[in-house]
Interface confidence: low
């Protein structure tokens, strides 16, 4: 459509729009008190309310306070985001006996398996330890990190929690951030596998591993305990969590007992070169520069790939798909990715500032 590349004078006389030279087109001007959900809003619903810090925009478009995890038996599972509350869960060594919206009203210590019983399923933040009778001939010691048995009493005392560094938390699901409410609800039902081992991990004989007994007295939790700022990788090694100390990075998820800290580019920047659990190179956003061209494609799955324009062509931030159709996807490897999903007449405004995660997806965080 030739009309799809308006010149600067296209917007003149229309006070509800302004011309953005960076993207070379007319953009909708968000009314006072509303903030754009994307670089160049296209319609009124690309604007949204901005909530105060520690508040999120609920499904009725109300700013609602995020729950707090300040109780000492709770840890933050997912942070307060622009469209979802903070989620708290019981800290390691405890499980939730009375649930509450986005949190837990009562946490209890995991039970310890009595004499003659071993751990069938270790306790989690949601469930107590499940015990089963020990097989004949099995020593009453810890046979493996998963199978512990206490040699003492026949009752089930409350377990002592495994000591946990204040720097760690028991994050068992990826934070649900950005996207639409429906996508968020779907994502919140998904749990993630532990992060892949880092290539810069320490071997378990290094000081990353605390010299605690494999099965602390009175505990039904047999996992290793790593030093602060280390996590237990899939191979059972204590591995250093990545650091977000670079100026252009912020922490996305904390260093947890079984997963690395993850870093993302700070608000106003986007990841140009990704790295395991972090970003190797952040560049300023917006990114429609003279040497890049946007290729519209399957916005939902592959997002928008920015790549060098073909030789001899004039760079253009917004090529129109020929015949109204998006071209086939190109490999997004080390490309700049901007998620365009949440912009179709959506009743899900997003808050400024726009942080962009290490996957390149906008993380629109009010928390």
């Amino acid at each position: 459509f030739p009309q799809d590349r308006p010149f600067e004078d296209t917007c003149h006389g229309n006070p509800s729009h302004y011309y953005d030279k960076a993207v070379r087109r007319c953009c909708y001007r968000c009314p006072m008190g509303l903030f754009p959900t994307q670089q160049c809003p296209q319609r009124p619903t690309d604007c949204r309310k901005q909530c105060e810090p520690d508040y999120y925009l609920d499904e009725a478009d109300r700013c609602t306070a995020c729950v707090t995890c300040s109780r000492d038996d709770l840890v933050e599972k997912t942070p307060c985001a622009w469209n979802s509350s903070r989620v708290c869960e019981c800290r390691p060594g405890m499980f939730c006996s009375t649930s509450a919206v986005n949190s837990c009203a009562r946490c209890f210590f995991h039970s310890v398996c009595p004499a003659g019983m071993i751990v069938k399923f270790p306790g989690t933040a949601q469930k107590n330890t499940v015990c089963e009778p020990a097989s004949p001939g099995v020593s009453p010691a810890c046979a493996s990190p998963e199978n512990c048995k206490e040699p003492s009493s026949g009752t089930i005392p409350q377990a002592k929690p495994t000591p946990v560094s204040p720097a760690t938390s028991s994050a068992s699901t990826m934070p649900v951030r950005g996207g639409t409410r429906l996508a968020q609800e779907a994502a919140s039902k998904l749990t993630r596998a532990p992060d892949s081992p880092s290539s810069v991990g320490r071997p378990s004989s290094d000081p990353g591993l605390s010299p605690t007994q494999p099965c602390p007295e009175g505990s039904g939790d047999c996992r290793k305990q790593c030093e602060p700022d280390y996590y237990l990788d899939e191979a059972g090694r204590c591995t250093a969590c990545v650091s977000c100390s670079r100026d252009d990075l912020v922490e996305k998820t904390p260093c947890a007992w079984n997963s690395s800290r993850t870093c993302e580019c700070r608000p106003g920047m986007i990841c140009a070169t990704s790295a395991t659990n972090s970003c190797a190179r952040c560049v300023p956003y917006p990114i429609c520069a003279a040497e890049t061209v946007t290729k519209p494609q399957d916005m939902a799955e592959k997002d928008t790939t920015f790549e060098a324009p073909p030789l001899g062509t004039q760079p253009d931030c917004n090529p129109t798909p020929e015949n109204g159709e998006a071209p086939a996807s190109t490999s997004p490897t080390q490309s700049l990715l901007v998620d365009s999903q949440a912009s179709k007449t959506l009743p899900i405004p997003t808050s400024a500032p726009v942080a962009l995660s290490s996957t390149g997806k906008p993380v629109l965080d009010a928390g």
Epitope: F1, Q3, D4, P6, N14, S16, H17, V23, R25, C26, Y28, Q38, Q39, C40, Q42, R43, P44, T45, G179, T180, L182, A183, A186, T294, P296, Q297, D298, M299, A300, E301, T304, N318, T320, P321, G324, E325, A326, A328, S340, Q341, A342, S343, K344, T345, L346, P347
Partner: antibody
Framework: EVQLVESGGGLVQPGGSLRLSCAAS????????MHWVRQAPGKGLEWVSA????????YYADSVKGRFTISRDNSKNTLYLQMNSLRAEDTAVYYC?????????????????WGQGTLVTVSS | DIQMTQSPSSLSASVGDRVTITCQAS??????LNWYQQKPGKAPKLLIY???NLETGVPSRFSGSGSGTDFTFTISSLQPEDIATYYC?????????FGQGTKVEIK
């Protein structure tokens, strides 16, 4: 040739269910928002539901919310509308339509491709 | 919800006449308005998108204008094949809504 073909319509009793399908061909299905629009006999057009590229976002008219579910299978280039708790007022020709909306590309609006429609009759 | 009010509901004009249909939105929708033509027993066809842009392959006698809440659709010279019902549709917010339609007949 860009084409949408609806199927699955028919006669159903009040309270019953139907599943409509819309087979897309001739374009990159996963790159487009898709919609269902209906038209009761002798009446105007009524938007029913929409779904985003990946299916991550869905939208419904108040009249069908909680009863109808829109979904898509991009691997099969097919759009669906699961209709439960059908009422007499749901009787209509149901059209699937392609929405060429693409964010960051101005003036890409409008249902530019429509199917031929499938008739759903809810009657006892 | 955004209500779309179309007028007139029907009109009769002679071949060659200039025909004008108006559409009013209950709130500001900027220029997010489309116009469709529907012939009996057929699916609707997009004619005008984003208030004033002519869809590819649509004759230039069809045009659209307007912004905010008031929009106009014009057939500059009515032809026999233009007998149909015309609908406006707002694309500014969900639920998307259509006008009630204008039936155009030849005198």
């Amino acid at each position: 040739e860009v084409q949408l073909v609806e199927s699955g319509g028919g006669l159903v009793q009040p309270g019953g269910s139907l599943r409509l399908s819309c087979a897309a061909s001739g374009f990159t299905f996963s790159s487009y928002y898709m919609h269902w629009v209906r038209q009761a006999p002798g009446k105007g057009l009524e938007w029913v539901s929409a779904i985003s590229w990946s299916g991550g976002s869905t939208y419904y008219a108040d009249s069908v919310k909680g009863r109808f579910t829109i979904s898509r299978d991009n691997s099969k280039n097919t759009l669906y509308l699961q209709m439960n708790s059908l009422r007499a007022e749901d009787t209509a020709v149901y059209y699937c339509a392609r929405d060429r909306f693409m964010p960051f590309i101005p003036n890409t609006l409008g249902f530019d491709v429509w199917g031929q429609g499938t008739l759903v009759t809810v009657s006892s | 919800d955004i209500q779309m009010t179309q007028s007139p509901s029907s009109l009769s004009a002679s071949v060659g006449d200039r025909v004008t249909i108006t559409c009013q939105a209950s709130q500001d929708i900027s220029n997010y308005l489309n116009w469709y033509q529907q012939k009996p027993g057929k699916a609707p066809k997009l004619l005008i998108y984003v208030a004033s842009n002519l869809e590819t392959g649509v004759p230039s006698r069809f045009s659209g204008s307007g912004s905010g809440t008031d929009f106009t659709f014009t057939i500059s010279s009515l032809q026999p094949e233009d007998i149909a019902t015309y609908y406006c549709q707002q694309d500014a917010d969900v639920p998307l809504t259509f006008g009630q339609g204008t039936k155009v007949e030849i005198k």
